[in-house]
Interface confidence: medium
């Protein structure tokens, strides 16, 4: 056996592991997707988190799951039964990811002031219906979590809720805002928000009470809730974690590259190893 | 921190127009409002319109319409409001202020610029 | 036009007082109703937003109150940095409307 054919033999196995590792990650990503779509409640209690934007991340996992398992499929078979054509559909898919995570990049960079105000519209927008239609619950769990994450109320300021019709308190009560607004931490009482979830709920109707995500807070007049908005919050996590997002994104890209790289070797060099191995049967 | 720093005082004579300066430093020019607010003496605060920086989307109030024109220049930060056609009765402080939104408090003002119209 | 009316136009009050201004509405508002401070030669500042929500850094002596038409500014316990103008604005319709103001001075 030649240092080529080795070598070759060696790209393949390597190329077969390493996709077989992310057919496994695709489809324990796709699982976890259609077990969210399936039962939510055993999904929140086994990771013990509020506020999970589960409705966008369960289509999130299951497509990513799919996409994952689909590319790692290709770069299995391809390599381990030396298929050209699949190896090279193989490269195509990467090439195409790669190209579109270059494209998205650019588009970041160059028009970051459209994008920011995209966001502040979307998020306005989803502040401004926040518990009125049900087909918006994913935006508002999503913002919710943002929320929660980020320890942030509001885009601007907490105030921000307050444009909210179903929000605004009138007269002795007090106004109200989503409960990821509220800073748990502020407070020894652990039953606080027990306290301030509004009995009145039921004014709003079954679309604030179908979801743990829209449950409504009151403000007591001295507030609990997050004073930054999530604007000023954003701007900080990216800025606190703008390495570990160059980094994870570098790594993938390089990844992506090594893949692309040794997929196009072996498919250019199957027909070698083939010829050479003829001349000898 | 967020700072609104205004054009100095200006004298003008009657018929003329006038052009205020307001430069904004310390946050997101094109991510918040700005308004325009004239304080004559002796009188109430009242409001003359606002922009959005973002797009140049105009609101007036219908007593300064036709002849207030309130523009921005994002490169500079710097938003102004001219008004034109000017008569006794519009001596006073004008004002600029940012606000998240159009239906919203203002936080932050500048210094304030005095116009006096005399001839 | 929304018309907001102010009440007292002037008030004489000492240190330690509890003052309180009222602001009405000409039609509901719906607590979209801002309170400003201004001393003399300096500019506005903004005290209570949404009625009753004190901006950020603003002395919890201030506090703001009110529904519908009428909205109210308490200060529970008057500094002597307290003496000034106080103005109420509406901000649920064009033209924004302020009131004439309250000029609150040394008794």
């Known amino acids: 056996m030649s240092a080529q054919e080795s070598c070759l033999s060696l790209i393949k196995y390597f190329l077969f592991v390493f996709n077989l590792f992310f057919f496994v990650l695709g489809s324990l990503i796709f699982c976890f997707g259609i077990w969210i779509l399936i039962d939510k409640t055993s999904f929140v209690s086994f990771v013990g988190l509020a506020f999970v934007p589960l409705q966008i991340w369960s289509k999130v996992l299951a497509i990513s799951g799919i996409f994952t398992m689909g590319i790692a499929l290709l770069g299995c078979v391809g390599a381990l039964k030396e298929l050209r054509c699949l190896l090279g559909l193989y490269f195509g898919m990467l090439l195409l990811l790669f190209a579109t995570q270059i494209t998205l990049g650019i588009l970041i960079s160059t028009q970051r002031a459209q994008l920011e105000r995209s966001l502040r519209d979307v998020v306005e927008k989803t502040i401004q219906k926040y518990g009125t239609n049900p087909e918006e619950t994913a935006a508002e769990e999503s913002w919710d979590y943002v929320q929660f994450q980020l320890r942030c109320c509001g885009w601007h300021y907490p105030q921000d809720w307050f444009q909210v019709l179903i929000l605004r308190g009138n007269g002795s009560e007090a106004h109200r805002v989503p409960c990821s607004c509220y800073n748990l931490s502020a407070t020894n009482d652990s039953t606080i928000l027990d306290k301030v979830i509004l009995p009145q709920l039921s004014r709003l109707g079954h679309l604030a009470r179908s979801r743990h995500s829209a449950d409504i807070c009151a403000v007591p007049a001295e507030s609990h809730i997050y004073r930054e908005g999530c604007a000023q919050g954003l701007q900080k996590w990216l800025h606190n974690n703008l390495i570990s997002i160059v980094g994870i994104c570098l790594g993938v890209g390089l990844l992506e590259l090594g893949f692309m790289t040794l997929s196009i070797f072996l498919c250019r060099n199957l027909d070698h190893v083939y010829n050479r191995l003829a001349r000898y049967r | 921190q967020v700072q609104l720093v205004q054009s100095g005082a200006e004298v003008v004579k009657p018929g003329a127009s006038v052009k205020v300066s307001c430069k904004a430093s310390?946050?997101?020019?094109?991510?918040?409002?700005m308004y325009w607010v004239k304080q004559a003496p002796g009188q109430r605060l009242e409001w003359m319109g606002y922009?959005?920086?973002?797009?140049?989307?105009?609101t007036y109030n219908q007593k300064f319409k036709g002849r207030v024109t309130i523009t921005r220049d994002t490169s500079a930060s710097t938003a102004y409001m001219e008004l034109s056609s000017l008569r006794s009765e519009d001596t006073a402080v004008y004002y600029c202020?940012?606000?998240?939104?159009?239906?919203?408090?203002?936080?932050?003002w500048g210094q304030g610029t005095l116009v006096t119209v005399s001839s | 036009d929304i018309q907001m009316t102010q009440s007292p136009s002037s008030l004489s009050a000492s240190v330690g007082d509890r003052v309180t201004i009222t602001c009405k509405a000409s039609?509901?508002?719906?607590?979209?109703v801002d309170w400003y401070q201004q001393k003399p030669g300096k500019s506005p500042k903004l005290l209570i937003n949404?009625?009753?929500t004190r901006h950020t850094g603003v002395p919890s002596r201030f506090s703001g109150s009110g529904s519908g038409t009428d909205y109210t500014l308490t200060i529970s316990s008057l500094q002597p940095e307290d003496f000034a103008t106080y103005y109420c604005?509406?901000?649920?319709?064009?033209?924004?409307?302020f009131g004439q103001g309250t000029k609150l001075e040394i008794k």
């Open positions: 310390g946050y997101s020019f094109t991510d918040y409002n």
């Open positions: 039609q509901d508002v719906s607590t979209a």
């Open positions: 949404w009625a009753s």
């Open positions: 922009i959005d920086p973002y797009n140049g989307d105009t």
């Open positions: 604005r509406q901000h649920y319709s064009t033209p924004f409307t």
């Open positions: 202020a940012r606000s998240p939104y159009g239906h919203y408090a203002m936080d932050y």
